[in-house]
């Protein structure tokens, strides 16, 4: 957690953020781990650290290695760990696995691919983008801020994505590049009438007296983004938040999953403490969508404690 | 010097309300993370409730999670916790205290605690 | 919620003798881990932080180990003034105690 891997390439800019955060007033130390040797503040020296950043303009391959961080507050000394390498400049164009980035995913709605570790460098528009190694050109490719937009994305713009642009440190400039691989989705989603996995209709839950008891509301609505869809508990037909009961209370926000590819979402009640007249009341599991609102029904029974004979 | 001073503890009946204050001092309240901590008569601690410095946001253990409400007010350096619909498992002592380094998203340590306040739920 | 289990629950010792207490969490916590001490009527106190760092003020006798799921606390030579409850707490994600370990004199 408090140990990040950087990379870089020889002979560009390479800027590493201590991975154990402060606050903005705390002061920061950089030591090489290896030897336990501070690194420099001053900016006239080719690795430099900078409050939070470590910066290496241009970066070595003998650079690599592990560098540790001691974030300090008036009473409180923190430690980080940044495990830097850099690699030799590849002749060709294949990027290896070891220089990419996190994978991102696209779709026709939604083809953003933003330039990986750029927001620690001090850089100005536009990007530079290639794909598999050609500069991208036409007019369905915008370079916008930090991101690249592709308008109209189909499956063969999937591939490996490099940004590249120039850092400016005190008037020298420095270039960089970042790869990272880009994913189309086919979005083919639909919208059905609400589909409730739990409970059953007519469920009876057993539950124990004084314990606490889960009630889960399960529910699919098609495939893809849904753009209403909802399940939600009442009880005795009255929202929960109406009821009054405050041992009785939905988790906050609602769980979304996709199963087999579908949007699901579902709803927990927790009843707390339960009590005998939570027995005679009605539990309401309900699911809607644009296409129409779906109930499933629970009642709860004791359940009878099992004797334990000797 | 760092000082937390809890009040407004007491004795209320199961299904009451009530509001605890913190009064902080010796240091700047606004840019500390604080923390309600609660320890029931001769159990262990048990964390209630977060709330950010100035932004604000708020964290809650889930036994308090929709009955209890905590708050600040920056320009008083004042913390509150409002506790409805306490039951009898809300007795405890309440301590308030601060974390000297929370970074939006993470937690930390309690470096200075108040001596707390007593709350007795019972009818 | 990540669970702290302490043991033992009770450690009986004489002054001058080491106190080894343990922290086990269920599941990692990295070192975002730290141990208080508190006395009868009195405020828990901070210790160690970061699994291993003694806070401010804290004599050098208190020392802390371990990483992920496994935790020590150290005291190397009991002073009297060291009877109490000791409490780790993890905030790896959000913050739990652990029950607490009472070292109480033999």
């Known amino acids: 957690k408090f140990s990040k891997q950087s990379w870089g390439l020889e002979n560009e800019a390479l800027i590493v953020r201590c991975p154990r955060q402060g606050k903005p007033s705390y002061t920061v130390d950089w030591y090489y781990s290896q030897t336990n040797k501070s690194i420099p503040t001053q900016e006239r020296n080719r690795v430099f650290a900078s409050g939070q950043l470590l910066k290496f303009l241009p970066a070595a391959v003998a650079d690599s290695g592990i560098y540790t961080c001691i974030v300090r507050s008036p009473t409180f000394n923190r430690t980080g760990y940044a495990n830097v390498t850099i690699y030799k400049k590849q002749s060709d164009c294949n990027v290896p696995d070891y220089l990419m980035y996190s994978t991102v995913s696209g779709s026709e709605k939604n083809s953003k691919i933003y330039c990986p570790t750029i927001d620690l460098y001090n850089w100005t528009a536009p990007l530079e983008w290639f794909k598999n190694c050609q500069a991208l050109q036409g007019s369905r490719y915008r370079a916008h801020k930090s991101f690249l937009v592709i308008d109209n994305v189909m499956t063969e713009d999937a591939g490996d994505y490099t940004c590249k642009f120039i850092h400016n440190e005190n008037g020298a400039n420095y270039s960089v590049t970042a790869t990272r691989s880009f994913t189309v989705k086919d979005e083919q989603g639909f919208s059905l009438f609400p589909v409730i996995g739990a409970p059953a209709q007519n469920e009876i839950k057993e539950v124990e007296i004084g314990k606490n008891a889960n009630l889960t509301c399960s529910a699919c609505f098609g495939k893809g983004t849904q753009f209403l869809a909802a399940v939600l508990w009442q009880l005795n037909g009255t929202k929960i938040t109406d009821f009054g009961e405050p041992r009785i209370q939905q988790e906050e926000g609602q769980n979304q999953s996709f199963s087999n590819g579908l949007a699901c979402l579902d709803m927990v009640l927790r009843i707390a403490d339960v009590k005998e007249e939570d027995l005679l009341l009605q539990y309401d599991c309900l699911a809607l969508n644009l296409h129409g609102l779906r109930r499933h029904t629970v009642r709860l029974s004791r359940k009878n404690p099992i004797d334990h004979h000797s | 010097e760092v000082q937390l001073l809890e009040s407004g503890g007491g004795l209320v009946q199961p299904g009451g309300s009530l509001r605890l204050s913190c009064a902080a001092s010796?240091?700047?309240?606004?840019?500390?993370?604080m923390i309600w901590v609660r320890q029931a008569p001769g159990k262990g601690l048990e964390w209630v409730s977060t709330i950010r410095g100035e932004g604000g946001g708020t964290y809650y253990a889930d036994s308090v999670k929709g009955r209890f409400t905590i708050s600040r007010d920056n320009s008083k350096n004042t913390l509150y916790l409002q506790m409805n619909s306490l039951r009898a498992e809300d007795t405890a002592v309440y301590y308030c205290a601060r974390d000297p380094w929370s970074t939006e998203g993470s937690f930390f340590v309690l470096d200075y605690w108040g001596q707390g306040t007593l709350v007795t739920v019972s009818s | 919620e990540i669970v702290l289990t302490q043991s033992p629950a009770t450690l009986s010792l004489s002054p001058g003798e080491r106190a080894t207490l343990s922290c086990r969490a269920s599941?990692?916590?990295?070192?975002?881990l730290a141990w208080y001490q508190q006395k009868p009527g009195q405020a828990p106190r901070l210790l160690i932080y970061d699994a291993s760092n003694r806070a401010t003020g804290i004599p050098a006798r208190f020392s802390g180990s371990g990483s992920g799921t496994d935790f020590t606390l150290t005291i190397s030579s009991l002073e009297p003034e060291d009877f109490a409850v000791y409490y780790c707490?993890?905030?790896?994600?959000?913050?739990?105690f652990g029950q607490g370990t009472k070292v109480e004199i033999k």
């Open positions: 707490q993890q905030y790896n994600d959000a913050i739990t």
């Open positions: 599941q990692s916590v990295d070192d975002d």
């Open positions: 010796g240091f700047t309240f606004s840019v500390y993370d």
